[in-house]
Interface confidence: medium
């Protein structure tokens, strides 16, 4: 399955929107820094494309879930959020189309299941952090920056997959 060129553009637009969503300076939130333990190894280049697509799908689905909560709606600009949802939704569609075309329809390898679980646990840590910080502006800013990092890393993986074709 070939992810369309528009998928890469959509990823870049998503990152741009995340950047535009910034409301406050991270330097006013130094004490709120947190290491969420992004499972970087799960996004390594050792994956076959069949194993990668579901992990990327899980990543984007979790981002969508995180930013579509009531607390998120209160924290961010509504117009930017709507555009953000649209981009994420399109990317989910692209990845789902790949699965339907036959990539990853075989028995899920254990490695892939572990990777999806690692991504879910990562987002659980983010959700717990926000809850503990009572969804403060600084907490959301730290999370926004973290999602930019993790999304950027997963985007790099997508690009490396395209270049291997």
């Amino acid at each position: 399955c070939d992810l369309p060129q528009t998928h890469s553009l959509g990823s870049r637009r998503t990152l741009m929107l995340l950047a535009q969503m910034r409301k406050i300076s991270l330097f006013s939130c130094l004490k709120d820094r947190h290491d969420f333990g992004f499972p970087q190894e799960e996004f390594g280049n050792q994956f076959q494309k069949a194993e990668t697509i579901p992990v990327l799908h899980e990543m984007i689905q979790q981002i969508f879930n995180l930013f579509s909560t009531k607390d998120s709606s209160a924290a961010w600009d509504e117009t930017l959020l709507d555009k953000f949802y649209t981009e994420l939704y399109q990317q989910l569609n692209d990845l789902e189309a790949c699965v339907i075309q036959g990539v990853g329809v075989t028995e899920t390898p254990l490695m892939k299941e572990d990777s999806i679980l690692a991504v879910r646990k990562y987002f659980q840590r983010i959700t717990l952090y926000l809850k503990e910080k009572k969804y403060s502006p600084c907490a959301w800013e730290v999370v926004r920056a973290e999602i930019m990092r993790s999304f950027s890393l997963s985007t790099n993986l997508q690009e490396s997959l395209r270049s291997k074709e």
């Epitope: 991270l26 130094l30 820094r33 930019m148 950027s152």
Partner: antibody
Amino acid sequence: QVQLVQSGAEVKKPGASVKVSCKASGGTFSSYAISWVRQAPGQGLEWMGIIDPSVTYTRYAQKFQGRVTMTRDTSTSTVYMELSSLRSEDTAVYYCARSLFPTIFGVEVAFDIWGQGTLVTVSS
Amino acid sequence: DIQMTQSPSSLSASVGDRVTITCQASQDISNYLNWYQQKPGKAPKLLIYGASTLQSGVPSRFSGSGSGTDFTLTISSLQPEDFATYYCQQTYSTPITFGQGTKVEIK
């Protein structure tokens, strides 16, 4: 590769003000915070404050509060540091320095790109 | 403000020597600690951030360790270009503060 290019050396009289510029060439600075650090002759490094250009956030060290003003001009990718009521002990090399990452916010608050420095001499 | 105390303030060493510089914070700063190298007339250069992460392009003979209040910069085998002044810096909270510096000189 982004470079920070600072304005030239200045000689000022006590009581005067100085405005040092720091221009990002080869890239944009809007996502990055810029700190100002000074170094008196033969002395160590002293952080003066920070400006985050995209949200116009500034934070100054208490020691310079009321005397320092950091501003930015996004159209020219330039940040400025103005120090007023100069005294002889303000004689130093003034550096602008960019924070290491624009978006990653873990432990990585560090200055990876520095300007060449601007010598400000305060003398009567 | 968080005080950063470096030791020694200067040291003499030979090429090939193993050099250790320590930095102590006046309160717990987790791993929000960076190391810089500065040569005369030049701007500082970032060596290590987050207490132990080597900055891109910095030789692997440089390493950092520590957490909390006590930190160490180690140069495993001193090279001629390593003779310089080294500074630690905390970014746990503002104001960001530096150690007073350690000058590494040729013996």
